[in-house]
Interface confidence: low
């Protein structure tokens, strides 16, 4: 089941999945001046069996300048609707990224791909948040969000992370802030 909306936005933070659940789709987007090849895949799909998961389909981009009689492939309106993007460059790749059963690793880049990747997540997907460079994290709990199914609707849990600029607090290596206990999290997980 695809998650209806995007992971929550945290000011001055980006999120990243360490691994992608089976069923996750990644749009085949090309950078400016390039387009998907004729009859090329619209997206890559994380599929697999009990022992191995991998990305099906291949994204391929070709120069828009190439003379071609076929109509240029452009995203359909529903494809274009706000789907959260994750920037490709990241300060570091988490070392504990994959090898989770039923999950795919970050797909390798393809020639002339767009600078941002657009994922369509599925229920059960977890994403991790980190403050952008120039901001530091004040933690109140887990800096992660999970797509859950509640009352037949999908929703993302709220990550307990605040990113503050050194200008605002006068320090980036400041004293540790008191930690709220997991039970004290504002996110309520009551069942129906």
């Amino acid at each position: 089941e695809l998650c209806d909306d995007d992971p929550p936005e945290i000011p001055h933070a980006t999120f990243k999945a360490m691994a992608y659940k089976e069923g996750t789709m990644l749009n085949c987007e090309c950078k400016r001046g390039f387009r998907r090849i004729k009859s090329g895949s619209l997206y890559m799909l994380c599929t697999g069996n009990s022992s191995h998961s991998s990305w099906d389909n291949q994204c391929q981009c070709t120069s828009s300048a190439t003379r071609n009689t076929t109509k240029q492939v452009t995203p359909q309106p529903e494809e274009q609707k706000e789907r959260k993007t994750t920037e490709m460059q990241s300060p570091m790749q988490p070392v504990d990224q994959a090898s989770l059963p039923g999950h795919c690793r970050e797909p390798p880049p393809w020639e002339n791909e767009a600078t941002e990747r657009i994922y369509h997540f599925v229920v059960g997907q977890m994403v991790y948040y980190q403050c952008v460079q120039g901001y530091r994290a004040l933690h109140r709990g887990p800096a992660e969000s999970v797509c859950k199914m509640t009352h037949g609707k999908t929703r993302w849990t709220q990550p307990q992370l605040i990113c503050t600029g050194e200008m605002e607090t006068s320090q980036f290596p400041g004293e540790e802030k008191p930690q709220a206990s997991p039970e004290g999290r504002p996110e309520s997980e009551t069942s129906c």
Epitope: M92, Y129, G134, A137, H139, F172, E176
Partner: antibody, heavy 122, light 104 residues
Framework: EVQLVQSGSELKKPGASVKVSCKAS????????INWVRQAPGQGLEWMAW????????YFNENFKDRVTLTADKFSSTAYMELSSLRSEDTAVYYC???????????????WGQGTTVTVSS | EIVLSQSPATLSLSPGERATLSCRAS?????IHWYQQKPGSSPKPWIY???NLASGVPGRFSGSGSGTSYSLTVSRVEAEDAATYYC???????FGGGTKVEIK
């Protein structure tokens, strides 16, 4: 390859100043904090200060606030640490180190310079 | 101010033995990091955010802890593990005094 290359050893007299450089390569210099850490002979590591080259902001360990000046030259991707009013206790290896974070937002020093030995002696 | 105390100061072990290095914080912290330093070399990130091994660190190393008590464990020490290990508070950048691991 991400690298921090520091200037060579210095021999200084008490009361003088020393300026150590740290040239960054292999990444966007203005996007990461540069920290300075020192290590006296046979001793542990002591964090001194940081500079964020993107905007020039600095922050200091209270012990060094009055004697350390940090600067960064975006064009040459070089950070500088100047320590004034030197005394014999300042004899140490001085390291620059880049701070990054893991996916939880926890800062740590992922790349270190090779160190610059500063000897203060009359 | 967070103060980190490491123990023991020196740990002398034979190859294959288990090593446990301790790092205690003066007040509760959410995470610490560990760095390895060999004589004449710069420190290297070894374990970050309490339990995550840095790139290239052998799997025999592990980190754990919470609150004021943290530890670095080597399941079976090898000659190449001889070094000084420092813990560091993730947020104030304070370092512990270090534990020197010697291999007999």
């Amino acid at each position: 390859e991400v690298q921090l290359v520091q200037s060579g050893s210095e021999l200084k007299k008490p009361g003088a100043s020393v300026k150590v450089s740290c040239k960054a390569s292999g990444y966007t210099f203005t996007d990461y904090y540069i920290n300075w850490v020192r290590q006296a002979p046979g001793q542990g590591l002591e964090w001194m200060a940081w500079i964020f080259p993107g905007n020039g902001n600095t922050y200091f360990n209270e012990n060094f606030k009055d004697r350390v000046t940090l600067t960064a030259d975006k064009f040459s991707s070089t950070a500088y640490m100047e320590l004034s009013s030197l005394r014999s206790e300042d004899t140490a290896v001085y390291y620059c180190a880049r701070a990054t974070y893991d996916h939880g937002g926890y800062w740590y020093f992922d790349v270190w310079g090779q160190g610059t030995t500063v000897t203060v002696s009359s | 101010e967070i103060v980190l105390s490491q123990s023991p100061a020196t740990l002398s072990l034979s190859p294959g033995e288990r090593a446990t290095l301790s790092c205690r914080a003066s007040s509760s912290v959410s995470h610490i990091h560990w760095y390895q330093q060999k004589p004449g070399s710069s420190p290297k990130p070894w374990i970050y955010a309490t339990s995550n091994l840095a790139s290239g660190v052998p799997g025999r190393f592990s980190g754990s802890g919470s609150g004021t008590s943290y530890s670095l464990t080597v399941s079976r020490v090898e000659a190449e593990d001889a070094a000084t290990y420092y813990c560091q508070h993730w947020n104030s950048f304070t370092f512990g005094g270090g534990t020197k691991v010697e291999i007999k």
